[in-house]
């Protein structure tokens, strides 16, 4: 159940070069520096565990620094293809080609990846966000336009010794930051290629990846302060549940999201919310430095364990799915917004979930491991927490099985 | 700054519709939703509605569903009303308002005056 | 829907002079209530949110009471610049509701 046998090559425990390599915060995605082309042009890329593609903005847009200037590039390859993307809510398309990309922070390779060069996009870079292009981590099987697209971190493997294996330390403030804040703060890890023992404390429980597209997870119970919501465990994982970086909220099945809301504001009665707060309208404030974290409860997932009739669970507490924001008008106080939202598309594990744990997507092994990491915030009463074993039947009924359709959710 | 600059006046005919717009700046426009109020003159402030900016979520005052409708255009940072069927009971002053805690920020009001 | 009432239309003050503007809900609320302040022919100025906290940069002759379904706004020392209309609004539960007004004259 636990990472405790002899490690293997490529997870040395420590990769000091990688570690705090990642900055930026919840609300508006966590970004790596990456060089594109030769000579090499320096972006800042989201982390997106969500998506599969490459795509770097390569046009001028309002909300873009700089950009991907493919002609300045000696080793650009054109493929002579399009991409178009479309979401929810807004696109993004552009021009597919090939190039040599590394990570400075990051494994000292160069490989040769697939870039999609975004021409045009509609609510999709974010103004003030500092990162000119995405890092589509998950599988070839929800590339854009087909699966035929080999995603970055495949074409990383094949090309290098790097171990078929990332993990992500997302680090939360715990405060709201300015511009000027967010660009000196650390915002975290992505360590490429192994595991580093010093962004966690305690062990590592896995949970499989049902299948290879999304980073797709079940949830077999949840626990609003150790209270079960007593659903069936398929409602958790209507119609998926995944664990996307590039999400801010943990968004929840619209009867997941209800029952969750439901238990929450009954245990945190002793204040009366607007009902605009569990919408995500309006913000919660207190005077600086009285909030009441301890009116509001834990929030446990369980996720299956590596072993048959086996769970563990993840609990996370109010300093994560209550995201502190920054509002000129009430600057005096504390002020947050409620994280948790309704979701038409499954469970999405986003940065509110991910904040509170070190995630190991060790795809060499089909599997995601979550410890308690060591740059979640909590206070001196409670703390993020990963237990287990625990005892569960019949987990594999809580899986839905989604009938065929191509679909996307990028970035929701 | 945060700011929320409308559209200016509007004189229309009576059973026809208007647009108004409301241009924000001074904050990042995704992560707060637009309100829109109406004032008549001796009538208070009534809430139309509003939009979440992030996902073109609305939710309406059940009064107004059928009148008003809202969109936004985040390349833009703008946010839209549409008023359609226009009579003289739609003669007001239109605010948006951006929510925080309750509305910390109004537009500067656009006057519509239906008149034939 | 919530009704929220203003009692008093118009209220008569003069500079210097305490005033309190009252308002009630038809309903609990908690203290999700706000106060703003619109000067002729100008839009609302939100002075007050969770009954009692002053926005930033409203002068702190401006406060704000009550929880539940009775709430009171409180100018004191009114100033002549205070003339104005006042408005309370709960945010508790859709649909928003404002109520009436109240029309501060000063002497």
């Known amino acids: 159940e636990t990472d405790e046998e002899p490690e293997e090559p490529g997870r040395r425990g420590s990769f000091v070069e990688m570690v705090d390599n990642l900055r930026g915060k919840s609300g508006q995605g966590y970004y790596v520096e990456m060089t594109v082309g030769s000579p090499p042009q320096t972006l800042n890329i989201l982390v997106d565990t969500g998506s599969s593609n490459f795509a770097v903005g390569a046009a001028p847009h309002p909300f873009l620094h700089r950009y991907y200037q493919r002609q300045l590039s000696s080793t650009y390859r054109d493929l002579r293809k399009g991409v178009y993307v479309p979401y929810t809510q807004g696109k993004w398309e552009g021009e597919l080609g090939t190039d040599l990309v590394s990570i400075p922070h990051g494994p000292n390779v160069t490989v040769r990846a697939n870039i999609a060069a975004i021409t045009e996009s509609d609510k999709f870079f974010i103004n003030g966000s500092n990162w000119e292009g995405i890092l589509g981590l998950a599988y070839a099987e929800i590339a854009r336009p087909d699966d035929s697209l080999e995603p970055f971190f495949d074409s990383l493997v094949k090309q290098t010794h790097v171990p078929n294996l990332f993990s992500l330390q997302l680090c939360g403030a715990g405060f709201p930051l300015n511009q000027s804040e967010v660009l000196a703060s650390v915002g975290g890890s992505m360590i490429i290629g192994g595991i580093d023992h010093s962004l966690y404390t305690g062990s590592l429980w896995y949970t499989p990846i049902r299948r290879e597209w999304y980073y797709e997870v079940i949830i077999v119970r949840v626990e609003i302060n150790g209270q079960d919501l007593k659903m069936d465990c398929k409602e958790y994982n209507y119609d998926k549940s995944i664990v996307d970086s590039g999400t801010t909220n943990l968004r929840l099945p619209k009867k997941v999201f209800e029952a969750a809301v439901k238990s929450i504001k009954a245990a945190s009665s002793t204040e009366k919310f607007p009902d605009g707060f569990w919408l995500g309208e309006q913000l919660v404030c207190w005077q600086a430095g009285t909030t009441p974290w301890n009116i509001f409860p834990v929030i446990s997932l369980y996720l299956m364990g590596e072993v048959t009739n086996q769970s563990f669970r993840i609990t996370i507490l109010p300093q994560q799915y209550l995201r502190p924001v920054e509002d000129v008008a009430t600057s005096q106080d504390d002020c947050y917004k409620f994280a948790i939202s309704q979701s038409s598309t499954g469970t999405v594990m986003g940065a509110v979930i991910m904040e509170g744990f070190y995630v190991v997507f060790d795809r060499a092994r089909k599997r995601i491991g979550f410890a308690v990491s060591a740059c979640h915030v909590h206070d001196e009463f409670r703390t993020a927490a990963v237990e287990g074993p625990f005892v569960t039947l019949d987990m594999e009924d809580c899986g839905y099985n989604i009938p065929q359709t191509d679909e996307s959710t990028l970035m929701t | 700054e945060v700011q929320l600059q409308q559209s200016g006046a509007e004189l229309v005919r009576p059973g026809t519709s208007v647009k108004l717009s409301c241009k924000a700046s001074g904050y990042t426009f995704t992560s707060y939703w637009i309100h829109w109020v109406k004032q008549r003159p001796g009538q208070g402030l009534e809430w139309?509605?509003?939009?979440?900016?992030?996902?073109?979520?609305?939710k309406y005052n059940q009064k107004f569903k059928d009148k008003a409708t809202l969109t936004v255009d985040t390349s833009s940072s703008t946010t839209y009303m549409h008023l359609s069927s226009l009579t003289s009971e739609d003669s007001a002053v239109y605010y948006c308002?951006?929510?925080?805690?309750?509305?910390?920020?109004w537009g500067q009001r656009t006057l519509v005056t239906v008149s034939a | 829907d919530i009704v929220m009432t203003q009692s008093q239309k118009f209220m008569s003050t003069s500079v210097g002079d305490r005033v309190s503007v009252t308002c009630k809900a038809s309903?609990?609320?908690?203290?999700?209530v706000a106060w703003y302040q619109q000067k002729s022919g100008q839009s609302p100025k939100a002075l007050i949110y969770?009954?009692?906290h002053r926005y930033s940069g409203v002068p702190d002759r401006f406060t704000g009471s009550g929880s539940g379904t009775d709430f009171t706004l409180t100018i004191s020392n009114v100033q002549s610049e205070d003339l104005a209309e006042y408005f309370c609004?709960?945010?508790?539960?859709?649909?928003?509701?404002f109520g009436g007004g109240t029309k501060l004259e000063i002497k």
């Open positions: 609004q709960q945010y508790n539960s859709y649909p928003y509701t």
């Open positions: 969770s009954a009692s």
């Open positions: 308002a951006r929510s925080g805690v309750a509305f910390p920020y």
């Open positions: 309903q609990n609320v908690g203290t999700n």
């Open positions: 139309i509605g509003m939009i979440d900016p992030s996902d073109s979520y609305t």
